[in-house]
């Protein structure tokens, strides 16, 4: 039975050029967490955390993706392109897969402001 | 389709570093999904895992080998490299390089393996 | 390590015959990490299962895997004359490290 929930920064916003955080946060669970998926809107993975050989960054994003912090991922160098759904992926034994969903919008303004709050989706 | 082609010496003499090179074509070694390995099978005898590499350079190796083994990566060839040094008798085996899913989770296992290469250790 | 035993060493079958090729982990493995492979004489293996149960590409349905924990299972429902080699299983987990079993030679009787 899976007693978990996947806390997200749900929809956030953040200029372009700059940089972003995509955190999720797995809770109400003793589960153990095999590997962390990052997935952008067009399901192409951006970045893998496995809990036994660490962070793996694809090769269309080793430039601006950093890991960190945590199980989280920073997206730096921002474009317009990368407004979108990402999608964290909890695999966990023996509970199984959980999935978070955020919305990132890239916003040309200076003064595009970036929400950090966690939401459960 | 994917392919994967050792290449290296046949001989080499004991106490010596053995060194074979894999070389992958039709797909990019810096696919984000899969390590690449190296699996070696004595004459005979069964199959022992080496170690695998990312495309990054991340490794992990077989701990009963690790002291004697390098694994490197060379993205701009589209190959990955075995090192193993100090080789006695008992290294001479075929070795086999093969695409490795680790990070696949429920698919975990070597999907795509090379024809193989002999390398025999002796004087 | 996980040491996996196959069983038995060789199986003296005929063609039509169903094969029931056994693997027993030394320690539970996570049935999403136990793979089967087929080797002929003079190639390299190839990937038949994954996941316990799963068929790789191109992999008759004659060929299906099952089991869990420390048991598992390969079954050949009918033997081809193609289907007579060496099989091996694999568990693949990181630390304790990947391992193979001993294999076992599928022989025509």
């Known amino acids: 039975m899976m007693t978990g929930t996947i806390e997200t920064t749900g929809n956030i916003s953040a200029k372009k050029g700059g940089s972003v955080i995509l955190q999720c946060h797995l809770s109400s669970t003793m589960a153990q967490v095999t590997q962390v998926n990052w997935e952008q809107h067009d399901h192409s993975l951006l970045a893998i955390r496995n809990a036994e050989l660490g962070w793996h960054i694809y090769p269309a994003f080793k430039d601006r993706v950093a890991p960190g912090p945590g199980l989280g991922l920073t997206l730096q160098s921002l474009t317009m392109n990368d407004t979108g759904e990402y999608f964290c992926t909890y695999h966990t034994y023996p509970d199984g897969t959980y999935r978070g969903r955020i919305f990132l919008e890239v916003l040309e303004s200076s003064v595009a402001e970036h929400s950090a709050r966690f939401q459960i989706p | 389709q994917l392919q994967l082609q050792e290449s290296g010496p046949g001989l080499v003499k004991p106490s010596e570093t053995l060194s074979l090179t894999c070389t992958v074509s039709?797909?990019?070694?810096?696919?984000?999904?899969?390590?690449w390995g190296w699996i070696r099978q004595p004459p005979g005898k069964g199959l022992e895992w080496i170690g695998s590499?990312?495309?990054?350079?991340?490794?992990y190796y077989n701990p009963s080998l690790k002291s004697r083994v390098t694994i490197s990566v060379d993205t701009s060839k589209n190959q990955f490299s075995l090192k193993l040094s100090s080789v006695t008798a008992a290294d001479t085996a075929v070795y086999y390089c093969?695409?490795?899913?680790?990070?696949?989770?429920?698919?975990?296992?070597?999907?795509?393996w090379g024809q193989g290469t002999m390398v025999t250790v002796s004087s | 390590e996980i040491v996996l035993t196959q069983s038995p060493g060789t199986l003296s079958l005929s063609p039509g015959e169903r094969a029931t090729l056994s693997c027993r982990a030394s320690?539970?493995?996570?049935?999403?990490?136990l793979a089967w492979y087929q080797q002929k004489p003079g190639q390299a293996p190839r990937l038949l299962i994954y996941?316990?149960?799963s068929r790789a590409t191109g992999i008759p349905d004659r060929f299906s895997g099952s089991g869990s924990g420390t048991d598992f299972t390969l079954t050949i429902s009918r033997l081809e004359p193609e289907d007579f080699a060496v099989y091996y299983c694999?568990?693949?987990?990181?630390?304790?490290?990947?391992?193979f079993g001993g294999g076992t030679k599928v022989e025509i009787k």
């Open positions: 093969a695409r490795d899913g680790v990070l696949t989770l429920n698919k975990r296992s070597f999907d795509i």
């Open positions: 039709g797909g990019s070694i810096e696919s984000g999904s899969y390590y």
């Open positions: 590499i990312y495309y990054s350079g991340g490794t």
């Open positions: 320690q539970s493995v996570s049935s999403s990490y």
């Open positions: 996941g316990a149960s």
């Open positions: 694999q568990q693949h987990t990181v630390r304790p490290p990947l391992t």
